[in-house]
């Protein structure tokens, strides 16, 4: 069968080989398409409800005034010339529709290095067959599931027209120290060959490099956090970051109801002050950062205290 590709909505003429150029003609067209079950026969004398879809012209050709998705299929003509010689024509018709230019919607203006970011969603509307969407970084194809690249795709079909809408959401994890203004674009590749890809306008988000946070240090005095009953413990939260963040205190994982301060003093230690303490530094540009936890305990005379603070957090104290 001869392969024919026709654009949806356009007319199509299929020639019936060997048919006399004008009536009387002995010919018959048979079609097996989305509009038929098995074969439908159309003859030159026809004319009727099928004319809107396909009709035999005076020269024996089959005319489809506006090809649709349901017209995909096989078209056969059997013709006999004046001498009684039979000729057969066989066509395989496939249809296509080029969508509008794809667009990137919900695009990010800024990405953060080192963490996954949504770059944007590429949308293509009105294609047939569905085709595919692909992403490019600085003109080179991006491969999903490689180097922090992930793509979420969705295909929908219009209930009336049968045309496809494709959506592709791109997530990337930019490398630290990489290109500060990467160029992303998306392209639609048609499902039928011999049609060039359609590319979106590019987008150029900025890549923001978060300053690596230095660790929050918690210093306990006396060292090890073991103190005799009635003694005093001083906890100091050291944060190298500038400007100085707000410091809050936790005991046994629960925030202490105290105003922010980098120093927590526990005077006249009693059993109620025992527990695990930590501090939380809150930066305006980053999230909260918690220190290691230290354990504060009471040692009875004659006991040896622990040599270092062990993991844990909280009891009310005085702030310096």
């Amino acid at each position: 069968a001869q392969n024919i590709t026709a654009r949806i909505g356009e007319p199509l003429v299929l020639k019936c080989k060997g048919a006399p150029k004008k009536p009387p003609q002995r010919l018959e067209w048979k079609l097996n398409t989305g509009r038929t079950e098995a074969w439908k026969v159309l003859s030159p004398q026809g004319g009727g409800p099928w004319d809107s879809v396909a009709r035999v012209l005076p020269n024996g050709s089959l005319f489809l005034p506006a090809v649709g998705i349901q017209d995909e299929g096989i078209f056969r003509c059997q013709a006999m010339n004046r001498n009684g010689k039979e000729t057969k024509s066989n066509y395989r018709v496939r249809v296509y529709q080029i969508p509008g230019k794809p667009e990137i919607v919900d695009s990010a203006s800024e990405l953060t290095a080192g963490v996954p970011n949504k770059v944007g969603t590429c949308v293509s509307e009105g294609s047939y067959p569905a085709g595919t969407l692909s992403w490019h970084l600085d003109g080179k194809p991006l491969v999903p599931n490689e180097k922090g690249v992930s793509v979420k795709e969705q295909t929908r079909r219009h209930p009336e027209t049968g045309l496809f809408t494709l959506q592709s959401e791109l997530m990337v994890t930019p490398a630290r120290g990489g290109d500060p203004r990467p160029t992303f674009s998306c392209s639609f590749s048609p499902g039928l060959p011999r049609h060039r890809a359609l590319r979106t306008a590019p987008i150029q988000p900025r890549v923001w490099e978060p300053v690596p946070l230095e660790e929050v240090q918690l210093v306990v005095e006396p060292e090890g956090g073991a103190v005799a009953p009635g003694g005093t413990v001083t906890l100091t939260c050291e944060v190298p970051a500038q400007p100085s963040p707000q410091i809050h205190w936790m005991k046994d994982g629960v925030p202490l109801p105290l105003p922010p301060s980098p120093v927590l003093i526990l005077p006249e230690i009693g059993p109620q002050d025992q527990g695990t303490y930590s501090c939380v530094a809150t930066h305006s540009s980053h999230g909260p950062q918690e220190s290691r936890a230290v354990s504060i305990s009471i040692i009875e005379p004659g006991e040896e205290g622990p040599t270092a603070g062990s993991v844990g957090g909280s009891g009310l104290g005085t702030l310096a």
């Epitope: 038929t36 079950e37 439908k40 009727g48 409800p49 099928w50 004319d51 809107s52 879809v53």
Partner: antibody, heavy 119, light 107 residues
Framework: EVQLVESGGGLVQPGGSLRLSCAAS????????MTWVRQAPGKGLEWVAS????????YYPDSVKDRFTISRDNAKNSLYLQMNSLRAEDTAVYYC????????????WGQGTLVTVSS | DIQMTQSPSSLSASVGDRVTITCRAS??????VNWFQQKPGKAPRRLIY???NLADGVPSRFSGSRSGTDFTLTISSLQPEDFATYYC?????????FGGGTKVEIK
Amino acid sequence: EVQLVESGGGLVQPGGSLRLSCAASGFTFNNYWMTWVRQAPGKGLEWVASIDNSGDNTYYPDSVKDRFTISRDNAKNSLYLQMNSLRAEDTAVYYCARGGDIRVMLDVWGQGTLVTVSS
Amino acid sequence: DIQMTQSPSSLSASVGDRVTITCRASQDVGIYVNWFQQKPGKAPRRLIYRATNLADGVPSRFSGSRSGTDFTLTISSLQPEDFATYYCLEFDEHPLTFGGGTKVEIK
């Protein structure tokens, strides 16, 4: 709202003529074939004529061929049926309906107009 | 010309009954059969298109099926508003041919 409204029916003598009209609204008229169907009193439905969306091609059953002419004016969203040489057996309610090809067939109907052929 | 033989020409049924109406085409018409409902003094209303598809706004108790050249309209549970005359229509070829109609009456 998609609507078809027929007019032009009435009493006519045998051998006489009558022109029915159908005003369409609520849809893109020139996208559809259009059809006339009739129903004699107490009888079933009978196809009378169809016309393609451009108006270039018309179709009739043998019972009305050469006597009836279907036409359309896409600019006016109107369908017409010119009936000549009327006979007693043409007495019926005449309905205008949207469609007439394999894509859309009689999905919307008008309320009908009565044609009586009698002396 | 294609003949559409519709049966029965009339039937009596009660509310809640399952009702089946059949049309047989004299030759292959593919899927190109519609079903219509008509009430006295009113225009026909399309119920089923292309043999099996329910038209917009039509209750789901109506359904259409096809087996070769036999076409069936089924009302799964007859309602008071379903008492009417039903017609099939073949539109694969001209002349377009309607079945003779089936009048559904209250038993």
